[in-house]
């Protein structure tokens, strides 16, 4: 059984202010069971951007159906980007538990925000 990998194919993404940013992430295995979460930054101060199973994230939508059996595409789209959204985003796989246990993180995708074209 191959070891789970979390793949973020783009090291960086540049988006104009006001547009939407797509952050890509795929997993190589459905096992073990557990959610994907997206964070900005690392360490204890990291910011939760999206949780696959719970919470309300009005600017974030999954690119693929998170409820679909066998879905391994955990890419997200963030709307109405502002300069405050700049940073490095990590797609992180957790193992289901009480609480969920962090298993593996993607390498991160740096989001840079360009000035809105005049």
């Amino acid at each position: 059984e191959e070891e789970l990998q979390v793949i973020q194919p783009e090291k960086s993404v540049s988006v104009a202010a006001g547009e939407s940013a797509t952050l890509n992430c795929t997993a190589t295995s459905l096992i073990p069971v557990g959610p994907i979460q997206w964070f900005r930054g690392v360490g204890p101060g990291r910011e939760l951007i999206y949780h696959q199973k719970e919470g309300h994230f009005p600017r974030v939508t999954p690119v693929s159906d998170p409820t679909k059996r066998n879905n391994m595409d955990f890419s997200i789209r963030i709307s109405n980007i502002t300069p405050a959204d700049a940073g490095t985003y990590y797609c992180v796989k957790f193992r289901k538990g009480s609480p969920d246990v962090e298993l593996k993180s993607g390498a991160g995708t740096e989001l840079s925000v360009r000035a809105k074209p005049s």
Epitope: I31, T61, D65, T67, K68, R69, N70
Partner: antibody
Framework: AVTLDESGGGLQTPGGALSLVCKGS????????MNWVRQAPGKGLEWVAG????????YYGAAVQGRATISRDNGQSTVRLQLNNLRAEDTATYYC?????????????????WGHGTEVIVSS | ALTQPASVSANPGETVEITCSGG?????YGWFQQKSPGSAPLTVI????KRPSDIPSRFSGSKSDSTGTLTITRVQAEDEAVYYC??????????FGAGTTLTVLG
């Protein structure tokens, strides 16, 4: 009790269009994916289309791809199947189904409830 | 399509197993009972082994490797029906088996 009531069947003309509606009750409609399944006379079950609980994601069987549109109105607890360019092969009983808290459209292993069905006959 | 036997038979009180294979990798199976053509199917097992509240405990489901199994213990005459399995293939499309006719002898 969970109920799924289909309507909109009947005699249809080849090349025409039909619109089937399923009204759900007895459960939190917006929390469950829904599917349409059909059964031609004397044949087995065939998956037609499915839709995620929030309506953002839709799925279609090969036999109706490009001719069908599935949609839902969670406020009205309804799911609709529109099928265009009808053929004789679309003659069947169409069942509305509910997923039981797992999976999405196309995940037939998750179906936990069925409607009574509505009969569609495509004939000139 | 999923693969299931065309027919099985059992005497009342016996245990019968119906198998289903061909679903996508890591997928689950559901089982649907249809007592007569044109009558609405009834879910007896979903998500491999979950049983709707109105289904007797004589019905159980399991999955080993990529094969799903419906087990009916203490078979009764009223269990005579066609049983369909359902799942999704690797592309995510819904698929059914062709159906297994259960005949209760005697």
């Amino acid at each position: 009790a969970v109920t799924l009531d289909e309507s909109g069947g009947g005699l249809q003309t080849p090349g025409g269009a039909l619109s089937l509606v399923c009204k759900g009750s007895g459960f939190t409609f917006s929390s469950h994916a829904m599917n349409w399944v059909r059964q031609a006379p004397g044949k087995g079950l065939e998956w037609v289309a499915g839709i995620s609980s929030d309506g953002r994601f839709t799925y279609y069987g090969a036999a109706v791809q490009g001719r069908a549109t599935i949609s839902r109105d969670n406020g009205q607890s309804t799911v609709r199947l529109q099928l265009n360019n009808l053929r004789a092969e679309d003659t069947a009983t169409y069942y509305c189904t509910k997923n039981g808290g797992c999976g999405s459209g196309g995940d037939l292993d998750c179906i936990d409830a069925w409607g009574h069905g509505t009969e569609v006959i495509v004939s000139s | 399509a999923l693969t299931q036997p065309a027919s099985v038979s059992a005497n009342p009180g016996e245990t019968v197993e119906i198998t289903c294979s061909g679903g996508g990798s890591n997928n689950a199976y559901g089982w649907f009972q249809q007592k007569s053509p044109g009558s609405a199917p009834l879910t007896v097992i979903y998500d491999n082994g979950k049983r709707p509240s109105d289904i007797p405990s004589r019905f159980s489901g399991s999955k080993s490797d990529s094969t799903g199994t419906l087990t009916i213990t203490r078979v009764q005459a009223e269990d005579e029906a066609v049983y369909y399995c359902g799942s999704a293939d690797n592309s995510g499309a819904g698929v059914f088996g062709a159906g297994t006719t259960l005949t209760v002898l005697g």
